[in-house]
């Protein structure tokens, strides 16, 4: 089982959309695949895929999950908020017929404020 995740780095504007893709491949067929997305180490969702369908379509706040055969698991964040910034990791495990697991590399998501001056204001108002 191998998992490839992309992109490595994603920078988007607040209020727009972010798409993270996880490609899950195995040389042999599988009956049930458990998938998991984490953000900064915390689990966002942990559905499974069987009979070509996801057991869950929601993944964390404003997150939608989809599976496109043969191998693409997509996490779409829409609309993106500032607290979506973080390190995302996709993990997958074949549960049936035999346990196999793998995880992707980190996708770092940076969310820019809708108003670019927000960053400067936040820094300027730092106490001291």
């Amino acid at each position: 089982l191998s998992v490839q995740q992309g992109p490595n780095l994603l920078q988007v504007r607040q209020g727009s959309q972010a798409t993270l893709v996880c490609q899950v491949d195995q040389a042999t067929a599988w009956e049930r695949l458990r998938v998991k997305w984490t953000k900064d180490g915390a689990i966002l969702c942990q559905p499974y895929i069987t009979n070509g369908s996801l057991s869950l379509g929601v993944c964390g706040p404003q997150g939608r999950l989809s599976w496109q055969a043969p191998s693409h698991l997509t996490l779409q964040l829409d609309p993106v908020s500032l607290n979506h910034s973080g390190a995302y990791v996709c993990w997958a495990a074949v549960e049936i017929p035999e346990l196999e697991e793998a995880e992707g590399n980190i996708t770092r998501l940076f969310v820019d404020p809708d108003d670019p001056t927000q960053n400067r204001n936040r820094i300027a108002s730092f106490p001291g």
Epitope: L1, S2, D25, Q26, A27, T28, A29, W30, E31, L33, I49, T50, N51, G52, A69, P70, S71, P97
Partner: antibody
């Protein structure tokens, strides 16, 4: 260009252990998502999958041979090996090494094959 | 184990004519999860190692002449050579990778009539 080359003795005595090595060139066997495989072909017959070792080191063997087979990897030499114990004349065959990727599931590259005869 | 049954065992076809080789699996090789058939076809010329022709039942490997085509789904598969050339004389094998142990058909020997 990926190349695989089998090496080992062409004659093995009954009850002994058959040992073959496959040297891979043009590609690192530590690359993730690959299965390094052994397949054999009895004279004038079909192909039989013996087993493979995954990048992680996990092995998968044909149940019909499992009790006698060991596949291992030597990453420092970019090689993988087959050991088949307690051989009989029925193990006389051409032995091939090949690779398979998670992204494919087919044997993409094969060695040229080496004939191993089991005879006293 | 999944049993792969090939037919015919041997086949003699005139140059330029169509050759058809069948492969029947003992269980379905189609996955509803990946929407793929886990079936490959190989060609083996005398004294050589097998070479992949077709993967996922119907996808021709890059560089393989378009006279070779694969079809079928589930348990029934066919390899067709639309116009036989002299260099196509070989043994042909189907192989499943739906599950381990991976298994091959016994092969079909293709000759020129």
């Amino acid at each position: 260009q990926v190349q695989l080359q089998e090496s080992g003795p062409g004659l093995v005595k009954p009850s002994q252990t058959l040992s073959l090595t496959c040297t891979v060139s043009g590609f690192s066997i530590t690359t993730g998502g690959y299965y390094w495989s052994w397949i054999r072909q009895h004279p004038g017959k079909g192909l039989e999958w013996i087993g493979y070792i995954y990048t992680s080191g996990r092995t998968y063997y044909n149940p019909s041979l499992k009790s006698r087979v060991t596949i291992s990897v030597d990453t420092s030499k970019n090689q993988f090996s087959l050991k088949l114990s307690s051989v009989t004349a029925a193990d006389t065959a051409v032995y091939y090494c090949a690779d398979m990727a998670d992204k494919g599931g087919w044997f993409a590259y094969w060695g040229q094959g080496t004939l191993v005869t089991v005879s006293s | 184990d999944i049993v792969m049954t090939q037919s015919p065992d041997s086949l003699a076809v005139s140059l330029g004519e169509r050759a058809t080789i069948n492969c029947l699996s003992s269980q379905s090789l189609f996955s509803s999860n990946t929407k793929r058939n886990y079936l490959n076809w190989y060609q083996q010329k005398p004294g050589q190692s097998p070479k992949l022709l077709i993967y996922h039942a119907s996808t021709r490997l890059s560089g393989v002449p378009d006279r070779f085509s694969g079809s079928g789904s589930g348990t029934d598969f066919t390899l067709t050579i639309s116009s036989l050339q002299a260099e196509d004389v070989a043994d042909y094998f189907c192989q499943q990778h739906y599950e381990t142990p991976l298994t091959f058909g016994d092969g079909t020997r293709l000759e020129i009539k």
